[in-house]
């Protein structure tokens, strides 16, 4: 059976604030638990939602969440079903509403003498307590002609008198919090002695130079004086007139006129009324010089046929707030249609290759105009103007390929070799008409090519074959001097390529044919075994039909190839004796002898007086000191040959000799002594 | 035993009504939730609606309105009244407790 | 309205064989796991095989599995034997206690 180990109760809950229903289930198998709010399934939302078994409200809401909630715990595997008791919230809040007139039924109905009842429409739960307030100033309960009823949250006025008029405003509070009137109520009864509003002045905008009028009226028996004062309190009148304010005249019903309104003009008015008794009042309108400012630019569209587009033009700032239209070849664009303005948004709807062209977004206002130019392009699909063609290009000269294309705007072109983006570099190179160029074609280039063209509404592309027509040349070209060891088997190689397969052979260079023991075969020169009389100067010629022939000249050296009669040995040398490496190297041509001591060739120009090679190769190191130490190497080498071999010199202390040793004993290890 | 059988299928003219009973015996209805779900000849399974413990009804988006489930615990049966029924209701109509405990099936079909 | 769609369709299979059969849902099931799946032979009611996504229904062998979240559900059968030729279907719960079938996969001896 299904059991609730934690059941949801009902609960106390402020509005906005977070809250939670508990619900623990245990049961014999899984269940899944939904929550119902008077019987209908409780669906997860950002603001009330399941966690866990239990229901979090983020912020209860006193709409949505009055009700029954209960927790349902389903087996769906068995059907049974086990439902929590009934929960639900007591939700405390408060709203702030507007102070009305209860009492008469309209303003118009107020008299002095009468009844009039206020009514404060700020409601919460529990019921709060009011307050009310006249010009800020709390009332009373009880105070003389008013009577506050909480019950109702009613103030009543009996009689209304001038005395009362002012500004009624109302709060109220409770256990959740406070709340004051959002909107307060103007009470005002007419004393015939205090001046009142007959007409307000309004604020105006006005061009330079051009005039501006404020009205201002007021009523009272007896009547009322009128005053006009400019921002820095200087009075305005027809008599006495600030410097800067020489063209403004006060009429006799109140209103006053500037003319050739300048910059020194502008700021804030006041029209002061003063009847017999009560405060003066105080009216005020600004007089705002009309101004506007430069438009900003518009990058040039691009746009594609088919296409919705909108194009936003950003009202210069100004005062009065500019107005904005459209224009397109001089006519101004409809509020519909297929090309039409909507707000300040050009808006091109199924864009025809037609709508290309310069649009004007015009901004006017009292001050002036301004407009501002967008360049809009149609793109259109690129055609062929001229396609690449399969091409045979020659093997180290420039190639070509074209693709040709015509597009609004101009297209971009991309190659393609093997599926591969061409990247520009020093051998591919794409002129701005699409032309690929092939600076020093090679044989690999023969392969496919693929051009494309695009531009924002489209792209077509195609395809050629590139075949390298190939140069006659050795692969690779035969060494110019090489040698061959005496009395040796050798093979000198010769392979060329060129657009059919060249045949090869060679030749003596003085013309004479080849000796039997020296046989062609298919390019390589074959020696059995090498004499003196093989050196000299051999020819390769390699030949085609359509290509010719070319030649390659190999000067052949027969040699005997070095080898050490004498090489170095390990050596050991006490520090300050001398040490001496012998090194003595055969061959044909004779071989020259050459040092290297840790890791750097030793100059014999740049020995100094320590060290010295000698005529047969041996090297001789005076006054040996520890960082001599290290491997000596010996090479041997002529025009065909080197070889090297290397042995290390170690510098030690010379030992103190101990008495227990004899003058004779030799050292632990070989030694040159000197 | 805790079994269910469901009766009351048949031929039935296009336009007619027809109430199918599921019989509930060893549980009570009242604990447990009940759903109906019918198969058309040949075709794949297809849930109807379901009662609730307390006697609420859900139903699928195009059962609603035609198809109407209720209960009488005291007779521990559940009913499937179905109203303006079509050629396309035709099928096999079970009765199922959870997903475990489903009844034989019944037949209804719809043709004139 | 919800849709639940099964695949494959129809599946043929030998004995032995590993079987995967997946549903897929239009929108979450209730706390993303509301998903069952059953086993129906010609002329019986639904058998029960799996609940709450991935549990083995009593008497189900453990070749049997399901797994899956939210909308997209796998049933898996290890090695198909003889007796497991049948039709199978996926069923969600969702919010609002509306419970919704796929329209079967139809499994057959290859």
């Known amino acids: 059976a299904i059991v609730f180990i934690k059941q949801p109760s009902s609960q106390d809950a402020l509005q906005g604030r977070r809250a939670l229903l508990r619900c623990e289930v245990e049961a014999p198998g899984p269940v899944h638990v939904y929550w119902l709010l008077d019987g209908a399934p409780v669906q997860d939302t950002e603001r009330r939602f399941a966690q866990g078994s239990s229901l979090s409200f983020a912020a209860v809401d006193r709409l949505q969440d009055s009700g029954t909630f209960q927790c349902v715990a389903r087996d769906d595997v068995t059907g049974e079903e086990a439902r929590s008791a009934n929960a639900s919230f007591n939700i405390k809040w408060i709203e702030a509403g507007p102070v009305v007139l209860k009492h008469p039924a309209s303003e118009a109905e107020i008299q002095p003498q009468t009844q009039v009842t206020l009514r404060c429409h700020i409601d919460g739960h529990p019921r709060p307590t009011y307050q009310w307030f006249r010009d800020g100033t709390p009332l009373s309960d009880g105070q003389s002609n008013h009577t506050v009823s909480s019950k109702e949250r009613n103030l009543t006025l009996r009689p209304a008198g001038p005395e009362h008029s002012g500004l009624y405003s109302c709060c109220a509070h409770s256990a959740f919090g406070q709340a004051c009137s959002s909107q307060n109520f103007t009470l005002s009864i007419a004393d015939e002695s205090f001046a009142r509003v007959v007409l307000a002045p309004q604020d105006v905008v006005v061009a330079r130079y051009e005039e501006a009028m404020f009205h201002c009226q007021f009523s009272a028996q007896p009547p009322p004086s009128l005053q006009w004062l400019f921002e820095d309190e200087t009075p305005i009148t027809n008599r006495s007139r600030p410097p800067h304010l020489r063209r403004a005249t006060v009429f006799a019903n109140g209103s006053l006129l500037l003319t050739q309104v300048r910059p020194r003009n502008a700021g804030i008015y006041r029209c002061i009324g003063q009847g017999q008794r009560g405060p003066p009042i105080i009216l005020e309108a600004t007089l705002h010089l009309a101004e506007i400012e430069d438009m900003p630019l518009f990058e040039p569209r691009v746009f594609t046929a088919g296409s919705e587009e909108r194009v936003t033009c950003l009202p210069p700032k100004g005062l009065p707030e500019p107005s904005v239209w459209w224009e397109h070849a001089g006519v101004r664009l409809p509020t519909h249609g297929r090309v039409y303005q909507k707000g300040h948004e050009l808006v091109l709807a199924n864009i025809a290759e037609s709508d290309a062209g310069v649009y004007t977004c015009h901004a006017a206002n009292l001050a002036g105009q301004r407009r501002q130019d967008v360049n809009i392009t149609v793109a259109t699909v690129p055609s062929w103007l001229k396609k690449p063609q399969d091409s045979q290009l020659e093997e180290g000269k420039p190639g070509y390929l074209d693709c040709l294309t015509q597009a609004t705007p101009k297209p971009t072109v991309v190659w393609y070799r093997n599926q591969m983006l061409i990247s520009e570099d020093s051998r591919f190179e794409v002129f701005k008409n699409g032309t690929l160029r092939i600076n020093s074609v090679e044989v690999y280039d023969g392969t496919w090519y693929r051009c494309m063209s695009s531009t924002p509404a489209g792209s077509i592309e195609a395809q050629a074959r590139v075949q390298v027509l190939e140069k006659l040349k050795f692969t690779p070209p035969p060494q110019p001097q090489q040698c061959m060891e005496f009395d040796k088997e050798a093979t000198v190689p010769c392979s060329a390529t060129g657009r059919e397969k060249p045949t090869i052979k060679w030749e003596r260079a003085d013309g004479s044919s080849l000796p039997e023991w020296v046989t062609d075969n298919a390019g390589t020169l074959h020696f059995a075994r090498v004499t003196r009389d093989d050196a000299g100067n051999y020819t390769c010629i390699a030949s085609n039909g359509p290509q010719g022939q070319i030649r390659a000249h190999v000067q052949l050296t027969v040699a005997v190839f070095i080898t050490f009669k004498v090489e170095p040995e390990r050596t050991t040398v006490y520090q300050g004796h001398t040490a001496l490496l012998q090194c003595e190297a055969q061959g044909d041509p004779k071989p020259l002898i050459q040092w290297k001591g840790k890791d750097r060739i030793l100059d014999p120009t740049k020995l100094g007086p320590r060290m010295h090679i000698f005529q047969n190769g041996s090297l001789v190191i005076h006054d040996v000191a520890p960082e001599d130490s290290g491997r000596y190497t010996c090479i041997a080498g002529n025009s065909c040959n080197i070889k090297h071999t290397e042995a290390p010199l170690y510098v030690v202390d010379k030992p103190v000799p101990e008495e227990s040793e004899g003058p004779g004993s030799p050292p632990p290890y070989k030694m040159i002594q000197t | 035993e805790v079994q269910l059988v469901e009766s009351g299928g048949g031929l039935v003219q296009p336009g007619g009504s027809l109430r199918l009973s599921c019989t509930a015996s060893?549980?009570?209805?009242?604990?447990?939730?009940m759903n109906w779900v019918r198969q058309a000849p040949g075709k794949g399974l297809e849930w109807v609606g379901i009662?609730?413990?307390?006697?609420?009804?859900y139903y699928a988006s195009w059962a609603k309105g035609r198809f109407t489930i209720s209960r009488d615990t005291s007779k521990n049966t559940v009913y499937l009244q179905m109203n303006s029924l079509r050629a396309e209701d035709t099928a096999v109509y079970f009765c199922a407790r959870g997903h475990y405990l489903w009844g034989q099936g019944t037949l209804v079909t719809v043709s004139s | 309205e919800i849709v639940m769609t099964q695949s494959p369709s129809t599946l043929s299979a030998s004995v032995g064989d590993r079987v995967i059969i997946t549903c897929q849902s239009s929108?979450?099931?209730?706390?993303?796991?509301?998903l069952a799946w059953y086993q129906q032979k010609p002329g019986k009611a639904p058998k029960l095989l799996i609940y709450?996504?991935?549990n083995l229904a009593s008497g189900v062998p453990s070749r049997f599995s399901g797994s899956g979240s939210g909308a997209e559900f796998t049933l898996t059968i290890s090695s198909l034997q003889p007796d497991d030729f049948a039709t199978y279907y996926c069923q969600g719960g969702y919010n609002g206690n509306i419970y919704a079938f796929g329209q079967g996969t139809k499994l057959t001896v290859l």
């Open positions: 009662i609730d413990s307390s006697g609420s009804t």
């Open positions: 709450y996504t991935s």
């Open positions: 929108q979450s099931v209730y706390n993303n796991n509301l």
């Open positions: 060893g549980f009570s209805l009242s604990n447990y939730v």
